[in-house]
Interface confidence: low
Amino acid sequence: TLSTPLSKRTSGFPAKKRALELSGNSKNELSRSKRSWMWNQFFLLEEYTGSDYQYVGKLHSDQDRGDGSLKYILSGDGAGDLFIINENTGDIQATKRLDREEKPVYILRAQAINRRTGRPVEPESEFIIKIHDINDNEPIFTKEVYTATVPEMSDVGTFVVQVTATDADDPTYGNSAKVVYSILQGQPYFSVESETGIIKTALLNMDRENREQYQVVIQAKDMGGQMGGLSGTTTVNITLTDVNDNPPRFPQSTYQFKTPESSPPGTPIGRIKASDADVGENAEIEYSITDGEGLDMFDVITDQETQEGIITVKKLLDFEKKKVYTLKVEASNPHVEPRFLYLGPFKDSATVRIVVEDVDEPPVFSKLAYILQIREDAQINTTIGSVTAQDPDAARNPVKYSVDRHTDMDRIFNIDSGNGSIFTSKLLDRETLLWHNITVIATEINNPKQSSRVPLYIKVLDVNDNAPEFAEFYETFVCEKAKADQLIQTLRAVDKDDPYSGHQFSFSLAPEAASGSNFTIQDNKDNTAGILTRKNGYNRHEMSTYLLPVVISDNDYPVQSSTGTVTVRVCACDHHGNMQSCHAEALIHPTGLSTGA
């Protein structure tokens, strides 16, 4: 049987029954159970650093008589490479440094073989080499760098983050893998629970506005933290998050702005800014006007981007009424944390002084435009109407009026510079120009730069000052053989006037021609008249041309009339009434021209 000389034999069992004995780094004695052997493991120290091979143990067979007839063979995990056996002596050695963390157990098989026959002299036996742990691994954190946040002003003991370190050494043997956490950097602000790695706040009233970033270094040490233990570290970057623990504060107690009195409502006139050491919504500020004589004259709005208060004009200002306003403006946090109210009110006030600057405003006319009327027969210096302008400034500065001569080159109109009365300076004629469009200027007497203009539309009203006239020059003819009451010409008249009820003309022969005339005028009562023959037949040799004076009158007031002359020639005609010859015999007989008889 193979045996290990150093092993204790269990009494009562004959030696020949033993299969194989081991000696060396075995921890406990082998025990037999019927015919099979339970081999206790060899324990081999890991990370052996000696210069020689590390001795593991010895195999021995009872059949070995020391004559070299037996050969020991090793097979299994690492046999021939990690583990070698002296085939003559059965000594086993480890050739390399072993690392338990790489492989903690090796299973090998041993055999004793007859060199001559090459046959085993014993059955093959299996045994274990267990690598014995040494503390050769330091704890390693799951992260090289942790980041965490915690609200500022947190109570002591507030959870921040948990760090974890692992140790590759054997947790079942000794304290090589028993990790204890401690804080190397970050006191007195933070603490770490030694067993859990939980980091907590350790200082009261940690203020983000004072310091926002903390770098905490945590150590994990094995051997339960005892001397000689290995350690690893990690960095925890902790950021204090903001809470609203700071009220807004105005950097100055008083602000002054200037604004012209002409600023329309809504005009921004200045910006004020309260500072708040907090950030985000905790630094949001609302501004309001809480007091002051300008409470109803100004507004303050909050610029959400810059957190500034913009003072704006609310109502129209009047320098002449008030030139300085003082306001009390308040800046407050809309998001307040009740637990910090003991620190005082989360608002601040400042005085805003607003100086209203004078703007000298031009005069303002009572109308945007004036429409006036005047009869065309108005005498020079007739008043047409008047314009009014006032200085809008409280003083009601006096104004003077003038006509813009670019709009009245002919100086037809004039204006009283003091009272704004418009009057004529020339005679008018509606028939020449119906509308006069002029511009009047109002200027502040004491400040000629301040002036305003207004259009005047002057309508010239019609007066019946034009007589009706023939619409054209009438030259007609009559056939020698014409019959009495024959229409030889229709007359029309025109009148430059424009009477309200329309034209109504009347036509008649002039009194001096009416009696004994060879022609008559028939008024058609439709502003036309006809010339009719008064006798049968005309002799062109007796009278070749008649000049008929026709009086045309209108029926407006005062009645206007004019006399127009119609020339009637006596002509020879064919039986259809077409002219054949119509000579001006009058040139031969000057006495032949007649007004009609």
Epitope: T326, A394, A395
Partner: antibody, heavy 123, light 107 residues
């Protein structure tokens, strides 16, 4: 040289009114405010109000509203103050004073003063 | 109205000395303060405005200082012609008001 020439002393009866003048020269009259201040033994110096000659705009101390009326005649560069319903309490020296220009932003500081008009109210 | 409290009511100093007159406002007037000098039988004269600025023609031995509600007028190297009554006046808002005056005499 800026000069403010005030009218002479006045002796008036209680209940009467008095109108005093202040003629300005040596500067652009319409560009500067004119304030009125009274000085009595009892009350030190008291600001009455101002008038802006360019526009005629006025402002009065609450105490003097209804008591004083300020007017201006630009053609003569003269400012007037009329005091109404006089009592012995109104006996004082009344000064007109030109305010600093608006360029200073210091409207109510007064850099030139008239010689004062003495008003005595006595029955 | 804003009250102006001036002190002392009177003081006496020797030629060449330095004197200081103080003025307290009942609320913050943000340096809107003027100092006037009034000699016997004369009209007041502006010395200082905006708390610290010397008016035209005022000797440099006069100086103004202060802020908020507390202001002072300092006269260095006192001269006999400085005998007068001195008034402070705020013009922060309407109505401007004056202090009760400080009478300065020469010993």
């Amino acid at each position: 040289e800026v000069q403010l020439q005030q009218s002479g002393p006045e002796l008036v009866k209680p209940g009467d009114s008095v109108k005093m003048s202040c003629k300005a020269s040596g500067y652009t009259f319409t560009d500067y405010y004119m304030a009125w201040v009274r000085q009595s033994h009892r009350k030190s110096l008291e600001w009455i109000g101002y008038i802006f000659p360019n526009s005629g705009g006025t402002d009065y101390s609450q105490k003097f509203k209804g008591k004083a009326t300020l007017t201006v005649d630009k053609s003569s560069s003269t400012v007037y103050m009329e005091l109404h319903s006089l009592t012995s309490e109104d006996s004082a020296v009344y000064y007109c004073a030109r305010e600093l220009g608006a360029d200073y932003g210091d409207y109510y500081a007064m850099d030139h003063w008239g010689q004062g008009t003495s008003v005595s109210v006595s029955s | 109205d804003i009250q102006m409290t001036q002190s002392p009511a009177s003081l006496s100093a020797s030629v060449g000395e330095t004197v200081t007159i103080t003025c307290r406002a009942s609320e913050n007037i943000d340096s809107y303060l003027a100092w006037y000098q009034q000699k016997q039988g004369k009209s007041p004269q502006l010395l200082v405005y905006s708390a610290t600025l010397l008016a035209d023609g005022v000797p440099s031995r006069f100086s103004g200082s202060g802020s908020g509600t507390q202001y002072s007028l300092k006269i260095n190297s006192l001269k006999s012609e400085d005998v007068a009554r001195y008034y402070c006046q705020h013009y922060y808002r309407t109505p401007p008001t004056f202090g009760s005056g400080t009478k300065l005499e020469i010993k």
